[in-house]
Amino acid sequence: GITNINCSGHIWVEPATIFKMGMNISIYCQAAIKNCQPRKLHFYKNGIKERFQITRINKTTARLWYKNFLEPHASMYCTAECPKHFQETLICGKDISSGYPPDIPDEVTCVIYEYSGNMTCTWNAGKLTYIDTKYVVHVKSLETEEEQQYLTSSYINISTDSLQGGKKYLVWVQAANALGMEESKQLQIHLDDIVIPSAAVISRAETINATVPKTIIYWDSQTTIEKVSCEMRYKATTNQTWNVKEFDTNFTYVQQSEFYLEPNIKYVFQVRCQETGKRYWQPWSSLFFHKTPETVPQVTSKAFQHDTWNSGLTVASISTGHLTSDNRGDIG
């Protein structure tokens, strides 16, 4: 950066090189050039010469004043016009930054995705700070009082093997940058209560041509958790509101859920599960599309796969890809 240049003088910022966005700031430049009594001192911001708000303080020093400085980053340098020098002489440069102190981190959430081997902790960091902000995640055993700290810039994955202080912990997040420090409330967790079952996936759908046509959705999960509660939501793609069906599920076999749907309409399905009675849900599964037949059953497949028509009695949709859910962050 500009801070690495060889200086023939000194540049400094008041109140500081990192300051709160919107502040009035002063940038001072003091020349110390051999055999040069500067005729004029110039300031440059991001390579562009500043024309206004420059005050000469004495023979070697000048001040540039900014009102309500709003740029997150700027490179400043100053030069001198020396007698008998054709070009301006560089005095010094400095990178300056403006931003905000961190907000109090809130909505601290820790979950263990089944089979991941990690506890994943996330939080709401609040408003953008614009400057380098670090987070320390504190994990303290309620049984041994031992505390571990993890330094991060965003979320954190903590190996469950490193959580050797029993099952009960407090977790809190400390946010710090050059302008301040804040700390979240403490979240009390029990490792057995924060496990999210292995993802539930809709594999296929079929519509059976009976007196009343019936659509069967086939879905499964690799979870080893015995008591699992799930929700399946579905709607016509033209609709805004979802219908939700609830299930108590045992994943020792593939689940089959029946729906009585309107004919000749494209539907979208999603499923999510949680350990029964626990706090956190899986994110909704990928969008699964199925079009019901007009009168003859139809075969369709997942997102972006063309609708295939079948003259037989059964119509199926098969999951082939993964389309990210629009609600993938919904674990609460």
Epitope: L142, E147, Q148, Q149, E183
Partner: antibody, heavy 121, light 112 residues
Framework: QVQLQQSGPGLVKPSQTLSLTCAIS?????????MCWIRQSPGRGLEWLGC?????????YYANWAKGRITINPDTSKNQFSLQLNSVTPEDTAVYYC????????????WGQGTLVTVSS | DIQMTQSPSSLSASVGDRVTITCQAS??????LAWYQQKPGKAPKLLIY???KLAAGVPSRFSGSGSGTDFTLTISSLQPEDFATYYC??????????????FGQGTKVEIK
């Protein structure tokens, strides 16, 4: 057995900086641990000054009344920690203790012998 | 800012008495509380940690109880060597930017 050995001057002039060192032996320096400083003015109670957490990173915590005046630094190559308190006044006259449990808990099984620091001209 | 309030500030008791000292935290500190004994000219000595766990080498006449905000140190039968000053200390977290002190004001146990 964890041992803490304190060193530093017993007399400091007003407005100067109080500097003390605490050398630690007998702990696993590869584990996480807290090292803290506490003081006790004559005839008064225990007053927490601050702590340093040493683990995968280093973090310091200071009593809010001391912020801006206090610095706790590790010198892990020598297995010791320093306390610096700037701009001292006679009110800073106290016995200063370093303390730890040798782990990342905040209660103190082990204490230094204490150093009486007098602030006087 | 978590504040620790200890009471009484002093008490007089006789050998064999049952003595109770209380400590109140201004917010929930779970079971993260320690008790210390200090004699004149000596460093404090850890008696109890995690509110109720006895430190190594501490006689069983000392016991601690409580969680959340209210805690008690009990000496079931006061002995001559127990005349000293006792302090509680919150051991929950020191990362809070507003902490002033983590110790209670102390309770001096004197001979009646």
């Amino acid at each position: 057995q964890v041992q803490l050995q304190q060193s530093g001057p017993g007399l400091v002039k007003p407005s100067q900086t109080l500097s003390l060192t605490c050398a630690i032996s007998g702990i696993d320096f590869n584990s996480n641990y807290y090292m803290c400083w506490i003081r006790q003015s004559p005839g008064r109670g225990l007053e927490w000054l601050g702590c340093i957490y040493v683990g995968s990173h280093v973090n310091t915590y200071y009593a809010n009344w001391a912020k801006g005046r206090i610095t706790i630094n590790p010198d892990t190559s020598k297995n010791q920690f320093s306390l610096q308190l700037n701009s001292v006044t006679p009110e800073d006259t106290a016995v200063y203790y370093c303390a730890t449990s040798g782990s990342s808990v905040l209660y103190f099984k082990f204490w230094g012998q204490g150093t009486l620091v007098t602030v006087s001209s | 800012d978590i504040q620790m309030t200890q009471s009484p500030s002093s008490l007089s008791a006789s050998v064999g008495d049952r003595v109770t000292i209380t400590c109140q935290a201004s917010e929930n500190i779970y079971s993260f509380l320690a008790w210390y004994q200090q004699k004149p000219g000596k460093a404090p000595k850890l008696l109890i940690y995690s509110a109720s766990k006895l430190a190594a080498g501490v006689p069983s006449r000392f016991s601690g109880s409580g969680s959340g905000t209210d805690f008690t140190l009990t000496i079931s039968s006061l002995q001559p060597e127990d005349f000293a000053t006792y302090y509680c200390q919150q051991t929950n977290r020191y990362s809070n930017p507003d902490i002033y002190n983590v110790f209670g004001q102390g309770t001096k146990v004197e001979i009646k």
